[in-house]
């Protein structure tokens, strides 16, 4: 279940038809309970389950949950009712795999058995010992037909299997030896892949859950959208715009009659499409229903635009920013048009794709110049740094996952699909094949499935988006599919426009308000920016013609 | 509702100047090319001038160019064409045109323009 | 420019019957064309945009077709009130160029 912070209600009213309604009148959904989660804080939620049948290495509790055996009896309840501690449970119990049971039903380690030392209050981990020298793992020159696990385990902390030459310490399913003796637990959740979305790890073993608005597919156990309207993939094939819904997968054209458009993005609140035009140079938005009118199509930028290959759109900041490659610069403005400012126009080479997270703060663009790259920065501009430079030729399209926070690209010229995570780290080469990524360009990412166009095949597929296996078809014959996003409210979650929270209206600045990026709790959270052709005054907020001030980029 | 009203047009002298004003509402003026396209009595429809959404570009027919000029006020929403050294092939019905992608979405009254001594 | 050659100049119609208007450009302009209708002493309205698509509140007794270079107008079922004249223009290239108009009568 997800966390039960986000997922209760307020008290003291009825909660809907597919939730549960707790003790203490919190709503949780159904499909939380006796999930052996504690989701309502008072357990009510796992009270009154139906009796489970547990494994034989599982231990009962009275309520039905399974507990593994070995935390019956080890000083902490596990059992959502207490009973793995209970008097009932503990007096002259059976005792766990890795203790030994005195005579009195006691328990105590069973390396503490034949260690020529009393453990037991009555001697009997000491009886029927043979008294000889301990061995070791491997130790081939011991008497025939001895058992080193009778004398102290063997010094294996859980279990001791006696062979013919020598002994081996093994540990249960979820445990991992440490030195070849002592077994530690497993943090299956070291790997990033080991779940969909929230790893969570447990003595012994680990389950997933899913963020708000996902629940688990009970058979594929990966995280998948709950609710709203169905996911589709809108892409461009340059002279219309086209959308895929994923679930019916029903195909429809929603801008026509398009001179050259590679470029586009959405904002799922209002439900607008922006794309540029590469014939017209220009920059449009629409909202979804009207964008096939002509007349409804609004220009946001028409001047000192030359080849924008990438656009992004921050919908939390109501923001866009693009790519340029003929004037080799990343620029940013309001949603309508009508202020914007030049963020980069050095060190760039061949700008194309470009995405944001507008909750941390950054954007993240590739360069397939001759040094291509995929770097970041703040949403203001500061705090550039190269994330790829190596083993990267041609990375066209890129795409960020906000809840696994890794950023994913294709190259079409080693025919790869990759990601990393978003401080550059845990790299990984998901798809190599000149088959499925023959000319690959726009890339997206929704739930379990990475998706992308590739032009030479003119195709949209998809693969899982944690191992790139389970590749398939979406579309073909499509005709120079170029730029491809996911629809659906999850993909652009709300939060919180750091420039309207300010006391001041749009942060106080006179011009342009930026997001900075979140480093740490002590990073700004907007800058001022200025246009081109001013600088940022000494207050940081106004802007000025005189072009003395060291910067045109400050912070609040 | 899409509203463009035209006004300044008249009776004006050869070489003479003359400032037409196209008042606009109903719509985001800042986000939308706007144009002016003339009508010569009994004659078709001939494009003018087109000035980009923030005023920044202009494009002009072969002949106006250095004689007429576009521009546009977005703080109060209204379109302007000066028109300098006017002759008398310009006299026509001026309109005020909202542009659409690749077409003329939306059309004013049109104000009619008279060079003639 | 982009040259849009109209024709015929100007026809007559009686009430029910049905016209065609041609447009053709010195050019392929991929339907990159729409049809305005003017009313005596009134300004331009839109008809049809990207050669073959209606515009809103227009009745659906106006159709466009064609592509390349080749463009017409049908009026099936004509009526008193689609007297005026038409023009085609192309929105391919800047500069946006017209046809010289066709004027309908009602005979």
């Known amino acids: 279940a997800a966390d039960p912070l986000l997922g209760g209600q307020g008290p003291a009213k009825e909660c809907e038809k597919d939730q549960f309604q707790c003790r203490n009148e919190r709503c949780i959904p159904s499909v939380w309970r006796c999930d052996e989660d504690d989701d309502c804080l008072d357990h009510s939620d796992e009270d009154d389950c139906p009796k489970k049948t547990c494994a034989d290495s599982d231990f009962t509790c009275d309520n039905g949950h399974c507990i593994h055996e070995r935390w019956k009896c080890d000083g902490e309840e596990e059992c959502p009712d207490g009973s793995d501690e209970s008097e009932a449970t503990c007096t002259l119990g059976t005792c766990h795999g890795n203790e030994f049971q005195c005579g009195d039903g006691t328990c105590v380690l069973a390396i503490k058995r034949c260690n020529q030392e009393q453990d037991c209050p009555d001697g009997s981990d000491e009886a029927g010992c043979l008294q000889v020298p301990p061995t070791f793992l491997g130790n081939r020159r011991r008497p025939r037909g001895l058992n080193e696990c009778l004398h102290n385990n063997g010094g294996c902390s859980h279990i001791c299997t006696d062979l013919k030459i020598g002994f081996e310490c093994t540990c249960p399913a979820g445990f991992q030896l440490l030195d070849q003796k002592t077994c530690g637990d497993i943090d299956e959740c070291k790997d990033p892949d080991a779940c969909s979305q929230i790893c969570v790890n447990y003595k012994g073993y680990f389950k997933c859950e899913c963020y708000p608005g996902y629940e688990m597919d009970l058979l594929t156990k990966n995280c998948k959208a709950a609710a709203g309207k169905s996911p589709s993939l809108i892409f461009t094939n340059r002279h219309e715009v086209r959308r895929i819904d994923l679930v019916k997968r029903n195909y429809s054209r929603l801008i026509p009659m398009l001179k050259n458009v590679v470029a586009l993005d959405m904002e799922v609140a209002t439900n607008r499409i922006y794309w540029c035009d590469l014939s017209y140079r220009k920059i449009y938005s629409a909202y979804m229903d009207k964008a096939s009118d002509p007349k409804e199509q609004e220009v946001l930028i028409d001047e000192q635009l030359h080849s924008p290959e990438g656009l992004a759109v921050d919908w939390v900041h109501k923001h866009i920013y693009w790519t340029d490659s003929g004037n080799k610069t990343i620029s940013v403005a309001t949603v309508d048009g009508g202020r914007r400012c030049t963020l980069f126009s050095r060190n760039l080479s061949e700008p194309r794709a470009i995405a944001v997270d507008p909750l941390q703060g950054f954007m993240y663009w590739s360069d397939w110049g001759n040094q291509a790259k995929i770097e970041k920065s703040g949403l203001n501009g500061v705090d550039r740094q190269t994330l790829v430079s190596d083993n990267i030729e041609w990375p066209n399209g890129i795409t960020l996952d906000l809840l696994s926070q890794r950023l994913y690209w294709v190259d079409s010229k080693l025919h790869q699909l990759s990601s990393i995570d978003f401080s550059g780290g845990n790299r990984k080469m998901l798809i190599s094949s000149t088959d499925f990524l023959s000319h690959p360009f726009g890339i997206a990412v929704f739930e379990d499935k990475v998706f992308w166009t590739d032009l030479e095949n003119e195709a949209i597929f998809s693969a899982n988006r944690l191992n790139g296996l389970e590749i398939s078809i979406l579309a073909e014959n499509l005709n120079n599919p170029h730029d491809i996003v996911i629809f659906h409210e999850l993909k652009q979650p709300r939060a919180a426009d750091a420039c309207k929270l300010s006391v001041q209206p749009n942060g106080g600045c006179e011009y342009l308000c930026l997001p900075a990026p979140q480093i740490s709790s002590h990073s700004p959270k907007y800058t001022c920016a200025c246009p081109d052709t001013m600088w940022l005054g000494p207050d940081m907020k106004r802007c000025y013609r005189d072009g003395n001030e060291d910067s045109k980029m400050g912070s609040t | 509702e899409v509203q463009l009203v035209e006004s300044g047009g008249g009776l004006v002298q050869p070489g003479r100047s003359m400032k037409l004003s196209c008042a606009a509402s109903?719509?985001?003026?800042?986000?939308?090319?706007m144009a002016w396209v003339r009508q010569a009595p009994t004659k078709g429809l001939e494009w003018v001038a087109t000035?980009?959404?923030?005023?920044?570009?202009?494009y002009y027919r072969d002949s106006v160019k250095g004689r007429f000029t576009i521009s546009r006020d977005n703080a109060k929403n209204t379109l302007y064409l000066q028109m300098n050294s006017l002759r008398s092939e310009d006299t026509a019905t001026y309109y005020c045109?909202?542009?659409?992608?690749?077409?003329?979405?939306?059309w004013g009254q049109g104000t009619l323009v008279t060079v003639s001594s | 420019d982009i040259q849009m050659t109209q024709s015929p100049p100007s026809l007559s119609a009686s009430l029910g019957e049905t016209v065609s208007i041609e447009c053709l450009a010195s050019?392929?302009?991929?339907?990159?064309l729409a049809w305005y209708q003017q009313k005596p002493g009134k300004s331009p309205q839109l008809l049809i945009y990207?050669?073959?698509s209606l515009e809103d509140g227009v009745p659906s007794r106006f159709s466009g077709s064609g592509s390349g270079t080749q463009y017409s107008l049908k009026i099936s079922n004509m009526q008193p009130e689609d007297e005026g004249v038409y023009h085609c223009?192309?929105?391919?290239?800047?500069?946006?160029?017209f046809g010289a108009g066709t004027k309908l009568e009602l005979k």
């Open positions: 045109i909202r542009e659409g992608t690749s077409l003329f979405a939306y």
């Open positions: 109903g719509f985001t003026f800042s986000s939308f090319p």
């Open positions: 000035v980009s959404t923030r005023g920044g570009h202009t």
């Open positions: 050019e392929d302009i991929s339907n990159y």
């Open positions: 990207y050669a073959n």
């Open positions: 223009q192309q929105g391919y290239n800047y500069p946006y160029t």
